[in-house]
């Protein structure tokens, strides 16, 4: 059979089963890709959007690895990646995605590795991904790369339908907490990268979930803003006994200022001000006590004023009662006139 043609701006190798369309200013996916392609690079172009049918079998029945990074993609539309039966690896990194359709992969995809480094900086794309994952369209996913996205929080339940996930990269974001993240369904998770975030403390709930993941052997927590107060006590205890954390000796406090630079593993309970109830900073406690005292004082003064003016208040109450009685008697009299048919004309023509 004659060799398949190579799209004009691209470079093809049948022996390597690879097509590269790199930095060619393409505005759409070339429609005439050779059927042998397993590895497709379309990077550094200006695609803008990826519509349904741009990539489809049977023409691309062998396509296993697809790199679409750095293409100025703003939208991946419903069905855009649905008809690729062999797709295992997808890189959408470095695209300013605003829309990632929950139906982009159709109902179910064989995808195993998904890279979205720097592609989820807009809320719409993140929520689209969350919907897509929760719908179970990527149940075969074993690697998910979400680094460098400026994420503050992950949508609740986002990781709930990923039973095959082995590697999760959340590094270089702005995550402040993991309270709403459930790791329980990630039974095959082996590595979790949370380095270069803004985590202040890991709560008991998160630590318990990690303890319950039998395959989880590599957790990276470096370069976070650990707050070394009483709330970190459980995390420190977990760190000391866990063999899951990479480079745990290097983890150090960022706050408060007096603790900055101190190694987490070398902290003692006595340094953490744990006499007060957990999770309430001592400065805040002092403020609440002071506020309570002020309110109590104001209440006492108010009662004292009432007590000292009790005669005046009694007289004032009597006056109000008399005024009310006079008012009510007026109403009572008018009611009686209106009720007597003989006095109806009188009542309507008088000022009573």
């Amino acid at each position: 059979q004659p060799p398949a043609a190579c799209p004009a701006p691209c470079e093809c190798s049948e022996a390597a089963k690879t097509v590269k369309c790199v930095n060619k200013n393409l505005t759409e996916v070339p429609p005439d890709l050779p059927p042998y392609v397993r590895n497709l690079f379309i990077t550094g172009n200006r695609l803008g959007r990826l519509p349904a049918g741009a990539l489809s079998a049977p023409r691309l029945a062998e396509l296993g690895s697809l790199n679409l990074s750095g293409n100025h993609l703003r939208a991946v539309e419903a069905g855009a990646l649905a008809a690729l039966p062999a797709l295992r690896q997808l890189d959408l990194g470095g695209n300013p995605l605003a829309e990632l359709s929950p139906l982009a992969f159709g109902r179910a995809s064989p995808l195993e590795e998904l890279a979205l480094r720097g592609a989820l900086r807009e809320q719409g794309a993140l929520l689209g991904l969350a919907d897509l994952l929760q719908a179970g369209a990527l149940r075969n996913l074993s690697r998910l790369e979400l680094a460098d996205n400026g994420l503050l929080l992950l949508p609740t339940g986002m990781l709930g339908a990923l039973p095959a996930l082995r590697h999760l990269d959340l590094s270089n974001n702005s995550l402040v907490g993991l309270r709403n993240v459930s790791f329980q369904g990630l039974v095959r998770l082996q590595s979790l990268n949370l380095s270069d975030n803004s985590l202040g403390v890991l709560r008991n709930g998160t630590l318990a979930q990690w303890r319950g993941l039998p395959a989880l052997r590599r957790i990276s927590l470096s370069h976070n803003t650990w707050v070394c107060d009483c709330a970190i006590e459980d995390m420190v205890a977990w760190l000391k006994e866990s063999d899951q954390v990479e480079g745990k000796e290097a983890l150090s406090c960022a706050f408060p200022e007096k603790m900055a630079g101190r190694a987490l593993l070398k902290l003692n309970t006595s340094e953490l001000n744990c006499s007060a109830p957990v999770d309430v900073p001592s400065q805040l406690q002092t403020s609440y006590v002071f506020l309570g005292i002020v309110l109590a004082l104001i209440g006492a003064i108010f009662l004292l004023v009432l007590y000292l003016n009790r005669k005046g208040i009694k007289k004032w109450m009597h006056n109000i009662r008399d005024a009310c009685r006079d008012h009510m008697e007026g109403y009572h009299y008018r009611y009686e006139i209106n009720a007597d048919p003989r006095l109806t004309n009188l009542s309507s023509n008088s000022d009573v």
Partner: antibody, heavy 122, light 107 residues
Framework: QVQLQQWGAGLLKPSETLSLTCAVY????????WTWIRQPPGKGLEWIGE???????NYNPSLKSRVTISVDTSKNQFSLKLSSVTAADTAVYYC????????????????WGQGTTVTVSS | EIVLTQSPATLSLSPGERATLSCRAS??????LAWYQQKPGQAPRLLIY???NRATGIPARFSGSGSGTDFTLTISSLEPEDFAVYYC?????????FGGGTKVEIK
């Protein structure tokens, strides 16, 4: 970790058929290229041919008329047959696999069998 | 068929020195080039693939560069275990071909 183990006859007479088998352990069999390479004594490496999961084959034109590579997916094995051997076919024969890492799409032969020395002599 | 020419055939150096090995293709192979190391009695070992990507477990002192027809393998500081024969190999066109090899020996 994927490993390859190969076996087959080491001593042949001219005009006989060389037959070698390579078994794949510890990894997926489908989706990869399976390759045979040989190295005559004191010389460089020569590519014989390869087969993929869909049983599509490619052979070195210099050997094409004599070579057959096949797979048995049920046993995770692939085989080499080279007919009408001569003394020039004396070499160490290696089986090898093309694997790779995430987001790198051209793979080198990163898994090799231990090699089988084949001598052709009358 | 694409012919790969390696130079020099032999490189005599001392441990700690820098080794620069060259591979030239008779026509463009894009970046579809790999480098292998082979020691006596052993199977080759993949060092570099796609011209510049280090294979799993390969030390950082090994680096590859080049595209098209000219490629280089550099060993920044030779260790005693690096003395071996090095082969380049292309996967741009069938048949796949290897270079003739460069032997790095102790001076």
């Amino acid at each position: 970790q994927v490993q390859l183990q190969q076996w087959g006859a080491g001593l042949l007479k001219p005009s006989e058929t060389l037959s070698l088998t390579c078994a794949v352990y510890g990894g997926s069999f489908s989706g990869y290229y399976w390759t045979w390479i040989r190295q005559p004594p004191g010389k460089g490496l020569e590519w014989i041919g390869e087969i993929d999961h869909s049983e599509s084959t490619n052979y070195n034109p210099s050997l094409k008329s004599r070579v057959t590579i096949s797979v048995d997916t049920s046993k995770n094995q692939f085989s080499l047959k080279l007919s009408s051997v001569t003394a020039a076919d004396t070499a160490v024969y290696y089986c090898a696999g093309w694997f790779g890492e995430l987001y790198h799409y051209y793979y080198g032969m990163d898994v090799w069998g231990q090699g089988t020395t084949v001598t052709v002599s009358s | 068929e694409i012919v790969l020419t390696q130079s020099p055939a032999t490189l005599s150096l001392s441990p700690g020195e820098r080794a620069t090995l060259s591979c030239r293709a008779s026509q463009s192979v894009s970046s579809y080039l790999a480098w292998y190391q082979q020691k006596p009695g052993q199977a080759p070992r993949l060092l570099i693939y796609d011209a510049s990507n280090r294979a799993t477990g390969i030390p950082a002192r090994f680096s590859g560069s080049g595209s098209g027809t000219d490629f280089t393998l550099t060993i920044s500081s030779l260790e005693p275990e690096d003395f071996a024969v090095y082969y380049c190999q292309q996967r741009s066109n069938w048949p796949l071909t290897f270079g003739g090899g460069t032997k790095v020996e102790i001076k």
